[in-house]
């Protein structure tokens, strides 16, 4: 018989914990992992056809 729905905290997942500065908490694997920085480009000038897509800085390797 299949299990019922899992809670959104996953399979016995601990609550998110503080990570060191170069890391962030991955809810999927429930651990701190290496993280890059999100970067939102400055808005285009008035009259631009569409908002600039959001991008990111790559994690440090």
């Amino acid at each position: 018989m299949r299990r019922g729905p899992r809670s959104l905290r996953g399979r016995d997942a601990p609550a998110p914990t503080p990570c060191v500065p170069a890391e962030c908490f991955d809810l999927l694997v429930r651990h701190c992992v290496a993280c890059g920085l999100l970067r939102t480009p400055r808005p285009k000038p008035a009259g631009a056809s569409s908002p600039a897509p959001r991008t990111a800085l790559q994690p440090q390797e």
Partner: antibody, heavy 125, light 107 residues
Framework: EVQLVESGGGLVQPGGSLRLSCAAS????????IHWVRQAPGKGLEWVAW????????DYADSVKGRFTISADTSKNTAYLQMNSLRAEDTAVYYC??????????????????WGQGTLVTVSS | DIQMTQSPSSLSASVGDRVTITCRAS??????VAWYQQKPGKAPKLLIY???FLYSGVPSRFSGSGSGTDFTLTISSLQPEDFATYYC?????????FGQGTKVEIK
Amino acid sequence: EVQLVESGGGLVQPGGSLRLSCAASGFTISSSSIHWVRQAPGKGLEWVAWITPGHGSTDYADSVKGRFTISADTSKNTAYLQMNSLRAEDTAVYYCARRVCYNRLGVCAGGMDYWGQGTLVTVSS
Amino acid sequence: DIQMTQSPSSLSASVGDRVTITCRASQDVSTAVAWYQQKPGKAPKLLIYSASFLYSGVPSRFSGSGSGTDFTLTISSLQPEDFATYYCQQSRITPPTFGQGTKVEIK
């Protein structure tokens, strides 16, 4: 340059075993999570397993739990998928992939950014 | 497990068309959705992560939106190289699950 290279696929009889390897270069696997995803011929993508090599945590799809084991050797920067008790329905191209994370208010915002070329596993008598 | 339901399963479009693919999660996944493009015989490529963030190197004609249970991938002006199969994936909770795919074909 980040690269993932799978190996170890092939033809195996039902009930047999195979060990797939995923050799990583250009990054350290201990700092991220590595996933195996498979694709049966003409079908969609199915996640199989993940490992966080830096912590040793693993998880599996229900369809492979108890038969497959994911592991990693951080000294070789390589992840593995040991597949036992193989069934015809395990026939697929197996990909390994790295999950990339970006910091969004302290939580990972990410996806699988680098994938291997895939290795075909055929289970047939 | 969280089910990801994509629609349509296939569509025919012409170069220059605006194409929209939707993905519905069976429960709230916040913004933890990624979109991938796959061409025959090739590995998938990440296009969008966290529902609306464009991955590095992906053309700006691709965009994503949504949160909670409903998500959209839009190609603003379809190019010849965009004919492929597209998958959504949630990564809010293990197991990470994919949609069944949407094949974008030439009309």
